[in-house]
Interface confidence: low
Amino acid sequence: HRRLDKIEDERNLHEDFVFMKTIQRCNTGERSLSLLNCEEIKSQFEGFVKDIMLNKEETKKENSFEMQKGDQNPQIAAHVISEASSKTTSVLQWAEKGYYTMSNNLVTLENGKQLTVKRQGLYYIYAQVTFCSNREASSQAPFIASLCLKSPGRFERILLRAANTHSSAKPCGQQSIHLGGVFELQPGASVFVNVTDPSQVSHGTGFTSFGLLKL
């Protein structure tokens, strides 16, 4: 297979060389080439240049990551960092800060709370939530972290859930929950993390994060 690829590459390279040579001959005004031929070749070349420039712009806009093989399959990845919030909502807040990743505009962090993807496919989605709680100060219910999905035209759905009982340590004991799984996402799908008590979440460096990676 590799040998065939090599032959194909060399053939393409030869065609490119012939094409570039022809342009050169056009520019030097060689008599053996008709004017019409030269015009056609020149406009073809201009078209290529235009395409290259447009691609460059698109790549700049869409990509801070290197493309995987073929422009049809760009790498899509995000990793965001927890953000303390004054809101009482159970949905955790995230930010593009510290050592975060946002590969391109095919994944976005919306309203600081959900990661939204633009391409359909299989994604590995994960979240780590570190919390500090005390059995006496907390309710009887365990601390629960949920990874949820919201798809256009679909109701919210819990993808993953984990529960930890509260620590007896004082003032509180640190514990971490890790959630992760592979799920098919539709264009426009959003994922977010819900917890029973956001006030117990630890926002120190590296403690609480959330991300996804298109497989």
Epitope: K150, R154, I158
Partner: nanobody, 119 residues
Framework: EVQLLESGGGLVQPGGSLRLSCAAS????????MGWVRQAPGKGLEWVSQ????????YYADSVKGRFTISRDNSKNTLYLQMNSLRAEDTAVYYC????????????RGQGTLVTVSS
């Protein structure tokens, strides 16, 4: 027991407006996303619109975007669908929909209210 009671349907001329309501009971209304689905004569269910628990998230099918507006009043346990610039193809039975707690993309719905758009 979950109860969803739709009202506000009727006969309306093309270009006209209607406001559908859905009175919900038997569950904690504010804890759920809610939505509207419809079924045209001889056709399958079509998703129309959806709203988040606190009203901040809304979704509309392309066919109704810009014409329909979903809203909710959590204090009254009521869901609304304001339908403007109605077209003949909007003729259907409209159902109020609530997700089932642990089911995947399935929902409870009411008896429905018929909307007929005709001149």
């Amino acid at each position: 027991e979950v109860q969803l009671l739709e009202s506000g349907g009727g006969l309306v001329q093309p270009g006209g407006s209607l406001r559908l309501s859905c009175a919900a009971s038997g569950f904690t209304f504010k804890a759920y996303d809610m939505g509207w689905v419809r079924q045209a004569p001889g056709k399958g269910l079509e998703w129309v619109s959806q709203i988040g628990r606190d009203g901040s998230f809304t979704y509309y099918a392309d066919s109704v975007k810009g014409r329909f507006t979903i809203s909710r009043d959590n204090s009254k346990n009521t869901l609304y669908l304001q339908m403007n610039s109605l077209r003949a193809e909007d003729t259907a039975v409209y159902y109020c929909a609530k997700p089932r707690r642990y089911a995947i993309f399935t929902f409870d719905r009411g008896q429905g209210t018929l909307v007929t758009v005709s001149s």
